[in-house]
Each structure stands twice: as structure tokens, then as C-alpha cells.
């Protein structure tokens, strides 16, 4: 109720002679701070004096008097919350009741705590899970209702007296709720741990034995078995007998059923600890074991490999790989069931024995077409020789062989002809499915392996074909040797190297790029007139009249070809100059007179110069000289000079007559 002081602490504390006690304690007084504290041992209330009697272990008063016992007993609390106590060392006669007499200004309280001190260190307690199964991890707990700051202890785990390798986790509690030391050990027991003794040993700080607790492990496990066989090597021949025995070395709980397995499959009606096999066959070869079950599950023995020996069975051949490509490598494997394994092999190709081949595998590093055919083998061991099986077929594939391109036409071939070619070959595996031709062209293939070239070109020099299955084999190219008229006929100036001037020596060459046949004739013409029949056309001294359009022709037995027209240009200085006058050579004064310098020149005149009757240069540079207004004094002879890049030419004199106007005559 509300008139009580509130305390929290463990109900009973445990220790042993010479150890110590640490008493965690909290309180809440009814009013104000604590003024007096007395620790009694086995206090008894005296009704006469209204006080408590008993041994005073500790006393704290206002006058500060402390009994001698205070060194052993310590109050570690305070005046309002903490009431923790320590007794170090603790003695056997400290057992009993501790009374905490608390007084504040107006209130008093007696709080009792039980102390149990034994003569010797008491043992810890081992806690085990309800069931332990092999290989399943469990936690072993060792608990001791003791902990004190002034007296360090340790808990150690032992298995059959030997410290356990697994790491234990130790924890301590010194709280108002509980005081203990605990060690926890995680452990995966094996079936072999069944019945073994586990110890939790209490030791002091120096590792000195204080006390212990022990338990015997009850590890549940499947039956553990041993198998024995006669004969011991488990190797027999067909018709022999074999005995196998199953022995249980351990089972917890007891076993309930027995069975036998071959290659993992249960054998029917075999439920005893002995398996008898009479007159064994090769099919009985395999891995045998016995299986015994209990409530935990089945246990299996190790496997015994029973080998029933027999002569090789008819063989089969495996080919890696068929079909094979010519030039590749191929491996043949002879497969025959036998025990023991065959020691010798005989190989056959198309029924004929292959000399020197006695291994299980035959390796051919480079396959050729003649390697194709049927391969078979015979296996042999100590018990006999097997039969030859049906064999396997090797298919050797290769590109078409001896491919040739054949021209079907009569020779020679002329430009524009239709040419037919065929593509032939000797052998092929697989069969030829298509053909290719080089060079590519817009040509037709009227049938497989035949090419038709319509309007054959002059430059169709060689043709090659390929016959193709999975691969293409190319024939050597064949020359068509097409005959054609001369090509690219053109006129070329040999001399002079620069432009042609009047009077130069000129040579023109009739060039062509090619002709087949090579024998040719030449023809030169100008304006439809035949000039010569040589490859060159020569002019000793060219004149402007030789200028014009020239062509040359080249012909051979196939036809003739003309060049493009070539313009021969002759450069010459201005010539045939003359001065013309407009409106005429007689002009009335005051009017306009225009003098024009006319000429024939190649290139055209670039510069004109005008002169008067005294050969005085007039300041005009155009083809036309305009006098406006013309004067009578301008009457006289005028001439002009024309200049181009070749040279100069001059005109003869032309006379201009300027007459007086009627006005002038009238004034006179």
C-alpha cells in the first residue's frame, strides 16, 4: 500500500565460504532523504523496546560512527535511490536474513534479504534440449546462481574430460532482478558422441577447480552399418556365388527394418542381414549396399562394387564426325561391353583388316576421299573375343575435283559474237548444286553449268567457272581471245609541242589504244578528201589554209574505226589589213567620220594603233576611230596597225576627204 517503502532486489543470494556477495538494490523512501541506515544479521523485533535486536554488520548514522565490521561490509547506496551492498569476504555464518533498517526524518522501514552461504562452492547446472539428433546443432547451457565483482570465476566445458574445441559464450547478470553466471556452447553432435559425458566445470580466476556438473549425451542417430562380402574383392565370373553380410555397429533408438539395394534400387524379398547371390550373371554387376532403419531414419552401409566378368559383346563403331570434310581429322571409337575391359582390338575398313590398329580408338589426322566406307571392329579380353558388329559408315565430303571451263564456240571469237561456255568437273561429294562465273556479267545461264554471253565485248579477256557443292572449286581461267576492230582512235599532234604558227613544220599522229588482230591500215581525210595512208600526216610548212577539221581511220580484218574530228588551228600575224570609212571616204565638215581597221588574224587582233599621213601615232586603241565633229584639216591619208600574240600587220593608206559645208562656203 501507499504506506510502504518500495524496494527492488533479488529475493535470495547464493555464495560460498571465502567468496563475496554483491547485492544489487534500489529503493524509494516515503518521505525525504535517508538519515540512518543499519544492516542487521538475523534481526528480531523487541516489543519491549520497540527496536530491532541482532548483529549489526553495518551502521551509518548522523554522528558518523562506524563499527569495525564496516571494512568487510560496504553500503554502496545513497540517500534516496540506491541501496546496493557488498560483503567481501562472505562467511558460512553470514547465511540467514539480512535486515536493512532505513530511517528518514519521519518514517522507518525494515527490508529483509535472504543470504545462502555454503561451505564449499556449489555446482553449476547443465541444461540440455529435450532431444539431440546427430549433425543437428544444439545449445548446451551451464547456469550458476552466483556473480560477484570481487570474486571472478570461469565456466569450462569438457567432453570425456577433455576441453571442448567449440567456443563458449559466457554472460553474467548482476541486476535487481537476477544474479547469475551463464555459459552457452553451440555444438553439432555426431553419432559417436552418444553416451559420452559432458562436464561444466566451475573454476576460479586461476583455473583452480571449484565444482562441476555432468550429463551423459543421448544422441539419436540412424543405424551405422558395416558390409562384408565373400569373395572379399567382389570380382567373380558368370555362374559364381556371392555372399554379403550387414552388421549394425550402432543405432539409437533400436533398428526396426533391414533391406538391400543395388545401384540405388531396393531388391525385393531381401530383408535379412545376409544376401546370397547364386550363379551370378553379368547383369548382376553393380553397386550393392544394405539399409537399416530406426525411428530417426534409414542408415546405409558403404557400397560394394560387384564385378561379374564376361567376354566382350558384339561391338559398335562411333565416328567423330561423319560426314567428314576432306583434310579434317576423324576419330573412330570401338564400343563393346566387357569385363574386364578389352585389351586388344582389331579394326576393319570395308571388311578388310586395318594393319597395325589395335587400340580402342583409331585417329586419322587428314581424311582423304578414299577413307570413305564401312568401319567395324572386334574387341578381346582375357575371357575371350567378341563378335564384329554391323559397323559405321564414314562419308567423306570434298569440293568438286578437276574443274575446267570449256569454250563451245568455233574460234576465233569476234566482238559481238554469242559465246557459249560449259563448266565441267571430275567428281564431287555432295553433288554439285550450282555454278559461279568470273567476272560477273549480265549473262544468261540457259542450263546448269552452261554460260551464254550475248554480244561478247572486246575486253572480255578471260572467263573462269566454279562448280559448287558446299564449297566452290574454281577452274583456271580460259582466254576468249576476242578479235575486234581498232579502238580509241584519235588524232594527236606530235610537233610542234606548242601552238601551230604559220610556216611551222607540223606532224599529226593517228593513235589507237588496241587492235586484235594487230595488223592495221591508216587513212587520213579532211572535208571528205583522202590525204594519206600512213600513221603520220606531215606538213613541211603549214599555212592558214591548212587549218580545218581532220580525221583518221584505222582498220583491221574485223573492221574500221574513225577518230573524232580534230581541228587544226594555225596561228598567224594580222594580214590583209585595210581601213574602211563610214559613211564613206568623203565627208562634210561637222559630221562624224568612223574609220575601221579590218584584218584577218589568228588569234584575233588584241591591239590597234592608228597613224596619220605623217606617220604620227594617234591616241586611239580601238578597232574603230571616230572623228566628231570632223574638220577639213582632218583630210588626209590614214593607216592602221594590228597586233596579236604572233606579230604585227599594217594596212595600206586610205584617204579621207573632208569638204566644206554649204554654210562655210556661204560665209566665204
Amino acid at each position: 500500500d501507499s504506506s510502504k517503502w518500495v524496494f527492488e532486489h533479488p529475493e535470495t543470494l547464493y555464495a560460498w565460504e571465502g567468496a563475496c556477495v554483491w547485492i544489487p538494490c534500489t529503493y524509494r523512501a516515503l518521505d525525504g532523504d535517508l538519515e540512518s541506515f543499519i544492516l542487521f544479521h538475523n534481526p528480531e523485533y523487541n516489543k519491549n523496546t520497540s527496536k530491532f535486536d541482532g548483529t549489526r554488520l553495518y551502521e551509518s548514522t548522523k554522528d558518523g560512527k562506524v563499527p569495525s565490521e564496516q571494512k568487510r561490509v560496504q553500503f554502496l547506496g545513497d540517500k534516496n535511490k540506491n541501496c546496493t551492498l557488498s560483503i567481501h569476504p562472505v562467511h558460512l555464518n553470514d547465511s540467514g536474513q539480512l535486515g536493512l533498517r532505513m530511517e528518514s526524518k519521519t518514517e522507518k522501514w525494515m527490508e529483509r534479504i535472504h543470504l545462502n552461504v555454503s561451505e564449499r562452492p556449489f555446482p553449476p547446472h547443465i541444461q540440455l534440449p529435450p532431444e539431440i539428433q546427430e549433425s543437428q546443432e544444439v545449445t548446451l547451457t551451464c547456469l550458476l546462481n552466483f556473480s560477484c565483482y570481487g570474486y571472478p570465476i570461469q565456466l569450462q566445458w569438457l567432453l570425456e574430460g577433455v576441453p571442448m574445441r567449440q567456443a563458449a559464450v559466457t554472460s553474467t547478470s548482476l541486476t535487481i532482478k537476477s544474479v547469475f553466471t551463464r555459459s552457452e556452447l553451440k555444438f553439432s553432435p555426431q553419432w559417436s558422441h552418444h553416451g559420452k559425458i559432458v562436464t561444466c566445470q566451475l573454476q576460479d580466476a586461476d583455473g583452480k577447480f571449484l565444482s562441476n556438473d555432468t550429463v551423459q549425451l543421448n544422441v539419436k542417430h540412424t543405424p551405422k552399418l558395416e558390409i562384408k562380402v565373400t569373395p572379399s574383392d567382389a570380382i567373380v565370373r558368370e555362374g559364381d556365388s556371392v555372399t554379403m553380410t550387414c552388421e549394425v555397429s550402432s543405432s539409437n533408438p533400436e533398428y526396426t527394418t533391414v533391406s538391400w539395394l543395388k545401384d540405388g534400387t531396393s531388391l525385393k524379398k531381401q530383408n535379412t542381414f545376409t544376401l546370397n547371390l547364386r550363379e551370378v550373371t553379368k547383369d548382376q554387376s553393380g553397386k550393392y549396399c544394405c539399409q537399416v532403419s530406426n525411428d530417426v531414419g534409414p542408415g546405409r552401409s558403404e557400397e560394394v562394387f560387384l564385378q561379374v566378368q564376361y567376354a566382350p559383346e558384339p561391338s559398335t563403331v562411333q565416328i567423330l564426325h561423319s560426314p567428314a570434310v576432306e583434310g579434317s581429322q576423324v576419330e573412330f571409337l570401338c564400343m563393346s561391353l566387357a569385363n574386364p575391359l578389352p585389351t586388344n582390338y582389331t579394326w576393319y575398313h570395308n571388311g578388310k583388316e586395318m594393319q597395325g590398329r589395335t587400340e580402342e580408338k583409331v585417329h586419322i589426322p587428314k581424311i582423304l576421299p578414299w577413307h570413305a566406307g564401312t568401319y567395324s571392329c572386334v574387341a578381346e579380353n582375357i575371357l575371350g573375343t567378341g563378335q564384329r558388329g554391323p559397323g559405321a559408315e564414314l562419308d567423306v565430303q570434298y569440293p568438286p575435283k578437276k574443274v575446267t571451263t570449256v569454250i563451245q564456240n568455233p574460234m576465233p571469237i569476234r566482238e559481238g559474237d554469242t559465246v557459249t561456255l560449259s563448266c565441267n568437273y571430275n567428281s564431287s561429294n555432295p553433288s554439285v548444286t550450282r555454278y559461279e562465273w568470273k567476272p560477273h556479267g549480265a549473262w544468261e545461264e540457259p542450263s546448269l553449268g552452261v554460260l551464254k554471253i550475248q554480244n561478247v565485248g572486246w575486253d572480255n579477256t578471260t572467263i573462269a567457272c566454279a562448280a559448287c557443292n558446299s564449297w566452290c572449286s574454281w577452274a583456271s581461267p580460259v582466254a576468249l581471245n576476242v578479235q575486234y576492230a581498232p579502238r580509241d582512235v584519235r588524232v594527236r599532234k606530235i610537233k610542234p609541242l606548242s601552238e601551230i604558227h604559220s610556216g611551222n613544220s607540223v606532224s599529226l599522229q593517228c593513235d589507237f589504244s588496241s587492235s586484235h588482230p594487230k595488223e592495221v591500215q591508216f587513212f587520213w581525210e579532211k572535208n571528205g578528201r583522202l590525204l594519206g595512208k600512213e600513221s603520220q600526216l606531215n606538213f613541211d610548212s603549214i599555212s592558214p589554209e591548212d587549218a580545218g577539221s581532220y580525221s583518221c581511220w584505222v582498220n583491221n580484218s574485223i573492221g574500221q574505226t574513225a577518230s573524232k574530228a580534230w581541228t587544226l588551228e594555225v596561228l598567224y600575224a594580222p594580214r590583209r589589213l585595210r581601213v574602211s570609212m563610214s559613211p564613206g571616204d568623203q565627208v562634210m565638215e561637222g559630221k562624224s567620220a568612223t574609220l575601221t581597221c579590218e584584218s584577218d588574224a589568228n588569234p584575233p587582233v588584241s591591239h590597234y594603233t592608228w597613224f596619220d599621213w605623217n606617220n604620227q601615232s594617234l591616241p586611239y586603241h580601238s578597232q574603230k576611230l571616230r572623228l566628231e565633229p570632223v574638220k577639213v584639216q582632218h583630210s588626209g591619208a590614214y593607216w592602221c596597225q594590228g597586233t596579236n600574240s604572233v606579230g604585227k600587220g599594217r594596212s595600206p593608206l586610205s584617204t579621207l576627204t573632208v569638204y566644206y559645208s554649204p554654210e562655210t562656203i556661204g560665209r566665204r
Epitope: 596619220d612 599621213w613 605623217n614 604620227q616 601615232s617 594617234l618 591616241p619 586611239y620 586603241h621 580601238s622 578597232q623 574603230k624 571616230r626 572623228l627 566628231e628 565633229p629 574638220k631 584639216q633 582632218h634 588626209g636
Partner: antibody, heavy 121, light 111 residues
Framework: EVQLQQSGPGLVKPSLTLSLTCAIS??????????WTWIRQSPSRGLEWLGR?????????DYAVSVKSRITINPDTSKNQFSLQLNSVTPEDTAVYYC???????????WGQGTLVTVSS | QSALTQPASVSGSPGQSITISCTGT?????????VSWYQQHPGKAPKLMIY???NRPSGVSNRFSGSKSGNTASLTISGLQAEDEADYYC???????????FGTGTKVTVL
């Protein structure tokens, strides 16, 4: 060293005649290797060739099409000078007028100092 | 007869090179090798700088050079100097009755 000295009024009334003279020193107006030219320059028309006079075996004149009907260029051998007369002037004829000598080539190596003529009433 | 076409202005920094073009027709620039160039400072008469397309009169700096291609003539001033700031005119002989034609003029500014 050829020198050209221009003279003439700086102001002419519209419809009247503009008259300028160019006195030559260092050469003869009758030289048979030179021509004597008048050129004008205005902001609106830039440099404009007007005409020339020259002597070879006789005297010749050439005039620009734009002024052909109004222009006269005359030599004065006695004073070794040549003159420009431009009739019926309008404000459009306001410009700086230059006389210049063309030598044996078609270029002007020698120029007068220029005369600003304003046509205004 | 219309004037020859020149750019209105060209500018350059001292030491740089500039080129002024002068475009005409086959009746003037393209037809004759009688192209000349004149320099004119404000208030002064024009001064001959180049004649007959590419010839330099004595006394004119060799920094001035002329050339012609087709119907277009060019004046190049290299190593531009402050005193080169002026108006420049081209001129050509022509086959028309107006025997000479001048360019529109180019103002050269030295930055």
C-alpha cells in the same frame, strides 16, 4: 617638269557659259605626243572625263557623249594654254574641274590644282 | 558609259595588306591593258599610282602593285601605313565615244 595652272570664275549663273583656262609650263600644247584633257569631279557623279584636244599633223578634239552638244575645248598656241567652254550650265554642272595631261600612254601623270565651279543664281 | 565598280570602303591595320577591286566590262577593263590607279587626299588633285595595269611611276612606293584578271583589275597596298589613308580611283580606256571611264572610288581607312 610639266605644270598646269587653272584659272576661271568659281560661280556661274544657270543657262550661261562656264569658261576655264589651263596654262601649260614645261611642255607645248602643240606637242605631238601629248593630249590635253578636262576632267570634273562631283559627289554625285564622281570623276568624269569631259574631253580633250591634241595636235598631230593637225588639231583634233574628242568629247564625252554626255556633254558633246555643249562643250568646246580649244588650244591657244600663242599663250601655250587650252580652254574649256560649257554652255547652258545647270546646277548639275557644279563640280571641281581639273585639267590634265595624257602622255604617250593612256593615263594622267600631271593634273591642275582643280577649280570649284558652282552653278547657282 | 557607266562607271567602273569599286568597293565603297576598305580598312586594315598598319603593316597589313589590302586589295581594292575594280570591275568593268570587255569594252573597257577586259579589252585593254590601259588601266590606271589614282590616289586622292582630301582637297587635293588625284595622283597617279599605277599605269598600264601594273606599272609604277618613279617616286611611287613599291608597296603599291596592280594586276588584272578578265574584266577585273586590282590594286594591292602591302605594309599599310597611316599616310595611305585616302580615296583611290581606277580608270580605263574604253571603246565607246567617251574614251575614258573612272571607278566609283574606294575610301581606305588605316585602323
Amino acid at each position: 617638269e610639266v605644270q598646269l595652272q587653272q584659272s576661271g570664275p568659281g560661280l556661274v549663273k544657270p543657262s550661261l557659259t562656264l569658261s576655264l583656262t589651263c596654262a601649260i609650263s614645261g611642255d607645248s600644247v602643240s606637242s605631238n605626243s601629248a593630249t590635253w584633257t578636262w576632267i570634273r569631279q562631283s559627289p554625285s557623279r564622281g570623276l568624269e572625263w569631259l574631253g580633250r584636244t591634241y595636235y598631230r599633223s593637225t588639231w583634233y578634239n574628242d568629247y564625252a557623249v554626255s556633254v558633246k552638244s555643249r562643250i568646246t575645248i580649244n588650244p591657244d598656241t600663242s599663250k601655250n594654254q587650252f580652254s574649256l567652254q560649257l554652255n547652258s550650265v545647270t546646277p548639275e554642272d557644279t563640280a571641281v574641274y581639273y585639267c590634265a595631261r595624257e602622255g604617250s600612254g593612256s593615263y594622267y601623270a600631271y593634273w591642275g590644282q582643280g577649280t570649284l565651279v558652282t552653278v547657282s543664281s | 558609259q557607266s562607271a567602273l565598280t569599286q568597293p565603297a570602303s576598305v580598312s586594315g591595320s598598319p603593316g597589313q595588306s589590302i586589295t581594292i577591286s575594280c570591275t568593268g566590262t570587255s569594252s573597257d577593263v577586259g579589252g585593254y591593258n590601259y588601266v590606271s590607279w589614282y590616289q586622292q587626299h582630301p582637297g587635293k588633285a588625284p595622283k597617279l599610282m599605277i599605269y598600264d595595269v601594273s606599272n609604277r611611276p618613279s617616286g611611287v612606293s613599291n608597296r603599291f602593285s596592280g594586276s588584272k584578271s578578265g574584266n577585273t583589275a586590282s590594286l594591292t597596298i602591302s605594309g599599310l601605313q597611316a599616310e595611305d589613308e585616302a580615296d583611290y580611283y581606277c580608270s580605263s580606256y574604253t571603246s565607246s565615244s567617251t574614251l575614258y571611264v573612272f571607278g566609283t572610288g574606294t575610301k581606305v581607312t588605316v585602323l
